[in-house]
């Protein structure tokens, strides 16, 4: 199973739940389908709220029990490292995959946290980051910002990545902007 | 008790198909994934293929996929194991175990000319 | 392809206690609570001796007993006794390829 990591602000956007949560117990597999449960205690919601409703508090997060179908293993012992993840919702329940955002949240850039605070929400509606995978590559539309990580280097460790997010400039345009300059 | 008893094993000649069986007791067969493991004359055991409770999901191991389907019938509970284009390197006793626990007793498979 | 390490034999007196170990890797023992331990004996199947790391199955003596510290897991049978004498395999839910087991290990008791 192989998958090349998105955008943080992609894997935010595409994600119904968005959290940062510790991992603190060993993977148990369900007998019946073979989905595997990590034991989690969520420290803080970066998204979801509405998609949860009342039902806040998410104390485990599945996937599946093999690397072949893309299951998510989880490799620190660290039961006090904080991580973010990105998932999806099924049935109430939080589901993630190899491909999912999942990171030790000291491995975030101050940009990157800020992100998933409280930026990357605002680009979700209109804006999309468009992967340059070889070149030439053009923008399809003036919502969309090229992401040329890949071109350059690993795409997660991209300046890109790891200090911007595609905003809203104006109705109909979006453009890279730094986290920097946001508002604290 | 559990009790998984195998069956439809036999001679076989290399290319040639058989088709084993499990049948399940003394649980809910729905709620189990099940799999096969097999072990060749003399040697250690080896699993070969595993299927979830519902049958939505199967997993091969490298050595048989391809010629190898599981699947299984909840409503018989049984299980089971079609094997096509069978090799010498088959022969082996198999058996159907539940999840990760219990084993069946067995059905030898010998491929030869 | 034995994924899980067991020596390949031991042996002890009637009476005396041995233990067994099964050494394999984070993605396996080390990464999951499904560590299971068969007896064989010739000619005959695989029988349950312990299942999930330490439980024991109805019927088994509480002779033997299983546990595990990091990779390494292992079975100690105690008291041992004549029909002990038999194939031990470990097994493990494998992460990469869903059941992974050890090559065995001849259990020879003395006298």
């Known amino acids: 199973c192989t998958c090349v990591p998105p955008h943080p602000q992609t894997a935010f956007c595409n994600s119904d739940l968005v959290i940062r949560a510790k991992f603190v117990g060993t993977p148990e597999v369900n007998q019946t389908t073979l989905y595997q449960r990590y034991e989690i205690k969520m420290t803080k919601m970066y998204k979801g709220f509405q998609a949860l409703g009342d039902a806040a508090d998410i104390r485990f997060v599945y996937t599946p029990a093999m690397e072949s179908v893309c299951g998510y293993f989880h490799r620190s012992h660290n039961r006090s490292e904080e991580f973010l993840i990105a998932g999806k919702l099924q049935d109430g329940l939080l589901h993630i995959t190899t491909c999912s955002f999942v990171a030790p949240w000291n491995s975030l850039s101050l940009a990157q946290r800020r992100g998933f605070t409280k930026t990357y929400t605002v680009g979700c509606e209109e804006c999309t980051v468009f992967p340059c995978l070889s070149i030439p590559c053009k923008l399809q539309s003036g919502t969309h910002c090229l992401w040329t990580d890949q071109l350059l280097q690993g795409s997660e460790k991209g300046f890109q990545s790891r200090h911007l997010a595609c905003l809203p400039r104006e109705p109909g345009l979006c453009t890279w902007q730094s986290l920097r300059s946001q508002i604290a | 008790q559990v009790q998984l008893v195998e069956s439809g094993g036999g001679l076989v000649q290399p290319g040639g198909s058989l088709r084993l069986s499990c049948a399940a007791s003394g649980f809910t067969f729905s709620s189990y994934a099940m799999s096969w493991v097999r072990q060749a004359p003399g040697k250690g055991l080896e699993w070969v293929s595993a299927i979830s409770g519902s049958g939505g999901s199967t997993y091969y191991a490298d050595s048989v996929k391809g010629r190898f389907t599981i699947s299984r019938d909840n409503s018989k509970n049984t299980l089971y194991l079609q094997m096509n284009s069978l090799r010498a390197e088959d022969t082996a006793v198999y058996y159907c175990a539940r999840f990760f626990d219990y084993w069946g007793q067995g059905t030898l498979v010998t491929v030869s000319s | 392809d034995i994924a899980l390490t067991q020596p390949a034999s031991v042996s002890g007196s009637p009476g005396q206690s041995i233990t067994i170990s099964c050494t394999g890797t984070?993605?396996?023992?080390?990464?999951?609570?499904?560590v299971s331990w068969y007896q064989q004996h010739p000619g005959k199947a695989p029988k349950l001796m312990i299942y999930d790391v330490s439980n024991r199955p109805s019927g088994v003596s509480n002779r033997f007993s299983g546990s595990k510290s990091g990779n390494t897991a292992s079975l100690t049978i105690s008291g041992l006794q004549a029909e002990d004498e038999a194939d031990y395999y470990c097994q493990s839910y494998d992460f990469k390829t869903y059941l992974v087991f050890g090559g065995g290990t001849k259990l020879t008791v003395l006298g």
């Open positions: 984070s993605s396996d023992v080390g990464g999951y609570n499904y």
